[in-house]
């Protein structure tokens, strides 16, 4: 019998390389049974996520699984760093893993740091 | 059923590019993560590094990390190893393992492994 | 590098004897998320690795439950409780927390 918790299916130690200025789209995937719950988004400052009020999200719907998104219209320098979904359930919180987003500021890149370059940054990574 | 199946040259010369392939026939790999991972012959195992298939980022061991390139083909399920430059060794089995999603995140499933050599 | 320390190197036991195979981590395996990313693996000749533990106490399905796994931090435990012929093999722990990936070097069950 398949479980009927909700579940956030962000990978865990997961990593999006971004530019400013593009338009960029934050997924959270949620699985949940009868009821969807209601999910927001926090942005990580240290070991605090802190909640993010008034930005615009919206649900997409596919197959087996919902998709709650953040999005970034556009993108800003500021919004480098790392994220995490958050469910409520039956009066329970539920976390997904945090993912990391590497903004590259187009002024100052002369060129694309490569994938793996970025996500060696120490100082970005939480988890 | 997972089912990964490295394959590639069993033979590279010296100062060659080693270079396998790795498809998995039994998940799709943009829901996983893919990993490398190497053993000499009579040794331990060494982790090469891994790709997030959905996105491409890669995540690779310093040790080897000036030499090697993991990518994947979302389109093929399937994720490629290079390693350049090689040396005596760099003779190894080499795996390639799917990491498990929520909640475990450990390496589950793995390919038969692919022996290469390096010799001239 | 976390540098992950197996003891023993290898070990010879008797059919019915219980084995213990130590890990040491360099540093704490407890991820920021609360869990414990350690992992133990059987490999046997001429074969992948086999996952048997993960999370540092869950038995994989299918695994035998003389096989057991404990620890924190950086002190691990794989203990077989009654050793059988099938499990001469070269156990590994693995931590799954810290970039990049470790391995133990390995420790080598034999029969006596």
């Known amino acids: 019998k398949e479980s009927c918790d909700v579940q956030l299916y962000i990978k865990r130690q997961s990593y999006h390389s971004i530019f400013a200025g593009d338009p960029f789209k934050l997924e959270c995937p949620v699985k949940y049974c009868a009821h969807r719950p209601q999910v927001t988004w926090c942005k990580l400052n240290g070991t605090t996520c802190v909640k993010l009020e008034g930005r615009h999200t919206s649900w997409k719907q596919e197959k087996n699984l919902s998709f709650f998104i953040l999005h970034f219209e556009p993108v800003l320098p500021s919004d480098n760093g790392s994220y995490r979904c958050s469910a409520n359930f039956l009066s329970a919180i539920i976390e997904s893993h945090s993912t990391t987003l590497y903004v590259t500021d187009v002024k100052s890149a002369s060129e694309r740091p490569s994938k793996d370059e970025m996500a060696s940054r120490p100082w970005l990574l939480y988890s | 059923q997972v089912q990964l199946q490295e394959s590639g040259p069993g033979l590279v010369k010296p100062s060659g590019t080693l270079s396998l392939t790795c498809a998995d026939s039994g998940f799709n790999i943009k829901d996983t993560y893919i990993h490398w991972v190497r053993q000499p012959p009579g040794k331990g195992l060494e982790w090469i590094g891994r790709i997030d298939p959905a996105n491409g980022f890669t995540r690779y061991n310093p040790s080897l990390k000036s030499r090697v390139t993991i990518s994947s083909d979302k389109s093929k399920n399937q994720a490629s190893l290079k390693l350049s430059s090689v040396t005596a060794a760099d003779t190894a089995v080499y795996y390639c393992a799917r990491e498990d999603g929520y909640p475990y995140y450990t390496l589950d499933s793995w390919g038969q492994g692919t022996t290469v050599t390096v010799s001239s | 590098d976390i540098v992950m320390t197996q003891s023993p190197d290898s070990l010879a036991l008797s059919l019915g004897e219980r084995a213990t195979i130590n890990c040491k981590s360099s540093q704490s395996l407890l991820d920021v998320d609360g869990k414990t990313y350690l992992n133990w693996f059987q490999q046997k000749p001429g074969q992948p690795p086999k996952r048997l533990i993960y999370?540092?106490?869950k038995l994989d399905s299918g695994v035998p439950d003389r096989f057991s796994g404990s620890g924190s931090g950086t002190d691990f435990t794989l203990t077989i409780s009654s050793v059988q012929a099938e499990d001469v093999a070269v156990y590994y722990c693995w931590q799954g927390t810290h970039f990049p990936r470790t391995f133990g070097q390995g420790t080598k069950l034999e029969i006596k």
């Open positions: 999370l540092v106490s």
